[in-house]
């Protein structure tokens, strides 16, 4: 057959071929192989991998694969003088110094490279001073502190718990409240869910376990020395003092038997409620300081970690598409981990290996699909999510000329109860019919399909019988297609039950115990969430790739539009009488959304009817349903954060890992009660309606019949 | 199995110094905090030192403060206790012990013991 | 720093008689208190942790109790075997000093 032949089998046969290629027992063994030692972004470990990933894609039948390098601000500490901190006395002895390296997990005693537990771009410092416990270091937190308890953190050490938020933002905020240095904590009341045992015998996080992470305020940039271009040879490179989103005092994280050791000395004020004590036998008091007898000892951060320029490697495949080679649909996740990533990414990268391996696999059988797939394995994502970005930057004329979607493979489980999807409004539709073909794994659900689990497990808050979809917001690879160039993008794992497990994230998330054996003991031994996560992200990919008309549904933007439109407008109209002096109207951009609303249902309804077998009407309607996304990009951007440039979308200001809705005026009317300046305040406010008014209805237009 | 075996005791006079190695094996060794305890003749037993399973904290009874260095070579394996201007009061059995795993304990008694090494300190 | 004392500092009983021995702390240490047994010319073995925690292996007879300063250890059946002197030691905070030791013998 030829390739264009083979396009035409019809599209069901094709997508149950490919789903039925995919195996469980493939990406147990993929994940094995992908977690038996560290693969820090880097290091020779790394690069090693990638090389691994380019010569199996190609054997599974990619058209071809390609490594791309960069060299990205990166950071390690030192392997000399390791970082730590102290309890000192009055004579400056140290009576208290928190761990070196986490305790290894059985079987991997012997393992090198494995980095200790760092804050990936903390600055050198050997800050002392006295401590101030700030809850989990959020805005509220310090409003709390500052405003109502009327506690000064200027000149202060800060403890905080992990949690709640993403950690740059607790270090943005300690920084503006004047703190000398953070230190990061897992409290037990987060990472330690009620009647599980800790690592090895359960999924818990013991006390000597870490969680690692970036602390940059990169708003979108990539590497922090070239924001806005690829990091290649020629590229100019500002200095460390230019560079963007990097912290200005020491931070340091620790587990929660150190914790123990410097919460429980703490003096000063009580903490203010409830919501600010953890699960430690300590009294979570505030401070500033220790408590009487110990009101002489202070806290000391020696922290020696360097930031340096270093080459990262992503591997990109392409299988090249039968009739619209020039359209892109890209599966993305990354490789690098913190140390052995069981869940994190490797969870994810195995997924992506056996989907391209069941896409490699069609493509040897003589199929092709319609459009062009990419398939990416990204380095970097721990240090912000640098190799997607620089190659995203790289090519970022092809990607919006040619991007029709973009779909996140990062961890395929945080938990296993039930399926969790973010994504575009655009890709709602396509996820509801494909879970319906889809059968669930779940316990008691034998037979039924997975959108019925899900809509049990996890219903929507506004429409009865249809599961929930959450808001992108960002903390992953996909943030450069979505939030900068207006890509359609989705995002699939499984996840817990939020109801019962409030702890933030899974209790091992980023320490040396995720492992092979946490997944295939604890999580997921059958690998059949595993097996549900690669159908989902690759169905996904299939139906973007090779769906005659693009499965995207503008009507369910016009919905959500709505939605937020009114959201924002009740934020607004908490402040009745300054809307009223300073004539503030949300009018206009209810009328867009209006208008959106009907342009939308009109295209949908000529969507529906046109011709399509005529090639150039279906190019062109594609191209209106490809472009809608890339019409909410606004070329200058949000205030202050020039790399979000979505309209509808952004990251919170507060919390990078949440979706924010009309993040432009959100932000202007954040604690404007506050605001030194109430006119300028309120008038910025309605010079964000107005853009947020002439996107909605620009984006309208672009559905408009064209002649 | 697990073992724990003390060498580099000995007869030493006043004033001069001693290098006291622990050898372990049959566990993984660079999970667990590590103690010294001795004994002098006829006496109970006496803590010395504590060295964290990656060093860490050290901790030292009053009795050997400023005298007496514990470390470990997670990489060998080993533990030791640099033992300087000893006196005749040193004279004891010493005896490695493991603490607790600090994969499972952050406080934790002595679970295993080395037979000990015998140091006297005479003129 | 802690101080660790025990009662009796020796104690004879016959076999088959209940003992309890006592250990204070001169304060608080939780319940991070520890038990062995030396027997003469023998290496220390470790008993119990976490004031009530028996070691595995430990007979069921041997039992320990209290929290914050006062704590017991009981041999509910005094057998043969069980002739020895046996320390408590506290283990909540450096240095961790053992008590002064209590010598069980057989009448």
């Known amino acids: 057959k030829s390739s264009s032949e083979a396009t035409n089998i019809t599209p069901k046969h094709n997508m149950k071929a490919f789903l039925d290629e995919l195996k469980a027992e493939n990406i147990k063994k993929f994940l094995h192989n992908f977690t038996q030692i560290p693969h820090l972004a880097g290091t020779e470990q790394n690069f090693q991998l990638a090389k691994q990933i380019q010569s199996q894609w190609k054997e599974f039948g990619l058209d071809s694969v390609e490594l791309t390098h960069y060299d990205v601000l990166l950071s390690y500490p030192n392997k000399t003088h390791p970082n730590y901190i102290s309890i000192i006395n009055e004579d400056g002895n140290e009576i208290f110094n928190t761990s070196l390296f986490e305790p290894p997990p059985a079987g991997y005693e012997n393992v090198s490279d494995i980095v200790p537990p760092f804050s990936a771009f903390s600055p050198q410092g050997m800050p002392e001073g006295d401590l101030v416990y700030v809850n989990y270091a959020r805005t509220e937190d310090f409003f709390k502190l500052e405003r109502d308890m009327k506690i000064n953190c200027s000149g202060k050490i800060v403890i905080a718990r992990y949690g709640k938020v993403f950690r740059g933002n607790k270090v943005k905020n300690a920084q503006l409240a004047g703190a000398t240095g953070v230190i990061l904590y897992s409290d037990p009341a987060d990472y330690f869910a009620p009647g599980v045992k800790s690592y090895p015998d359960g999924w818990n996080l013991p006390g000597g376990g870490v969680q690692r992470g970036n602390i940059l305020n990169l708003n979108g940039a990539g590497d922090p020395l070239t924001p806005g271009y690829p990091a290649n040879e020629y590229a100019y490179r500002r200095g460390i003092a230019e560079a963007v989103g990097l912290p200005s005092i020491p931070v340091h994280p620790i587990g929660y038997y150190d914790a123990q050791k410097l919460l429980e000395k703490m003096g000063g004020s009580a903490s203010p409620d409830s919501s600010w004590r953890g699960s430690l036998k300590v009294p979570y008091n505030v401070g500033p300081g220790f408590t009487g007898n110990f009101s002489t000892q202070k806290v000391k951060m020696h922290i020696h970690s360097t930031s340096e320029v270093t080459r990262i490697y992503n591997v990109i495949g392409t299988l090249r598409g039968a009739v619209e080679p020039d359209r892109y649909v890209i599966l993305g996740g990354h490789r690098d981990s913190w140390v052995f990533g069981g869940i994190d990414p490797q969870s994810g990268a195995a997924v992506v290996h056996e989907i391209v391996r069941s896409f490699g696999t069609l493509k040897k059988e003589g199929w092709r699909p319609r459009r062009t797939i990419l398939f990416a394995s990204w380095d970097a994502e721990e240090f912000g999510l640098l190799g997607s970005t620089e190659w995203a930057e790289e090519n970022s004329r092809l990607l919006q000329e040619r991007g029709v979607a973009y779909i996140n493979a990062d961890s395929s489980i945080e938990g296993n109860y039930t399926l969790r999807v973010d994504c575009t409004p655009l890709m709602y539709s396509l996820v509801y019919n494909l879970t319906k073909e889809l059968e669930s794994p779940d316990e008691g659900f034998e037979g039924k399909s997975l959108y019925e689990s899900w809509t049990k497990k996890s219903p929507s808050p506004e429409f009865s019988g249809m599961p929930r979809i959450s808001k992108l917001g960002s903390g992953n690879d996909f943030e450069v297609f979505f939030q900068r160039l207006g890509i359609a993008s989705g995002r699939a794992r499984y996840t817990k039950n939020w109801e019962t497990n409030k702890f933030s994230s899974y209790p091992l998330y980023h320490s040396v115990y995720e492992t092979y054996e946490l997944v295939e003991k604890f999580y997921d031994p059958m690998f059949k969430y595993h097996l549900t996560v690669a159908q989902v992200r690759g169905g996904m990919v299939f139906e973007l790739a090779n769906s005659v008309v693009l499965p995207f549904d503008c009507r369910d933007y016009a919905v959500v539009l709505r939605k937020y439109a009114d959201k924002i407008y009740n934020i607004s109209m908490k402040h009745p009488q300054e809307m009223k002096t300073y004539s503030v109207s949300f009018d206009s951009l209810f009328s867009a959304v209006k208008n959106f609303t009907e342009i939308a249902s009109k295209f949908s309804e000529r969507l529906r009817d046109f011709d399509k077998s005529n090639p150039i009407l279906l190019r062109m309607m594609n191209d209106q349903l490809m472009f809608l996304e890339r019409a909410f990009i606004d070329p200058l951007g949000l205030p202050d954060r020039p790399f979000y440039r979505h309209v509808i979308y952004a990251p919170s200001s507060h919390n990078k890992y949440a979706g924010e809705s009309f993040p432009g005026i959100y932000d202007a009317l954040f604690d404007i009660e506050s605001k030194v300046d109430p006119s300028q305040a309120w008038g910025e406010v309605k010079r964000q309606i107005s853009i947020a008014t002439f996107t909605v209805q620009a984006a309208a237009e672009t559905l408009s019949e064209v002649a | 199995q697990v073992q724990l075996v003390e060498s580099g005791g000995g007869v030493v006079q006043p004033g001069r110094s001693l290098r006291l190695s622990c050898a372990a094996s049959?566990?993984?060794?660079?999970?667990?905090?590590m103690h010294w305890v001795r004994q002098a003749p006829g006496k109970g037993l006496e803590w010395v030192a504590v060295?964290?399973?990656?060093?860490?904290?050290?901790y030292y009874a009053d009795s050997v403060k400023g005298r007496f260095t514990i470390s470990r070579d997670n990489s060998k394996n080993t533990q030791y206790l640099q033992m300087n201007s000893l006196r005749a009061e040193d004279t004891a059995v010493y005896y490695c012990?493991?603490?607790?795993?600090?994969?499972?304990?952050?406080?934790?008694?002595?679970?295993?013991w080395g037979q000990g090494t015998t140091v006297t300190v005479s003129s | 720093d802690i101080q660790m004392t025990q009662s009796p500092s020796s104690l004879s009983a016959s076999v088959g008689d209940r003992v309890t021995i006592t250990c204070r702390a001169s304060?608080?240490?939780?319940?991070?208190l520890a038990w062995y047994q030396q027997k003469t010319g023998k290496v220390p073995k470790f008993l119990i942790y976490?004031?009530?925690t028996l070691q595995s292996g430990v007979p069921s007879r041997f039992s320990g109790g209290g929290s914050g300063t006062d704590f017991t250890l009981t041999i509910s059946s005094l057998q043969p075997e069980d002739v020895a002197t046996y320390y408590c030691?506290?283990?909540?905070?450096?240095?961790?000093?053992f008590g002064p030791g209590t010598k069980v013998d057989i009448k």
């Open positions: 976490e004031a009530s």
């Open positions: 304060q608080g240490i939780s319940n991070y």
């Open positions: 012990a493991r603490g607790g795993d600090f994969l499972y304990y952050y406080y934790y008694g002595m679970d295993v």
């Open positions: 049959g566990f993984a060794f660079s999970r667990y905090g």
């Open positions: 060295i964290w399973y990656d060093g860490s904290n050290k």
């Open positions: 030691q506290n283990y909540n905070s450096a240095p961790f000093t």
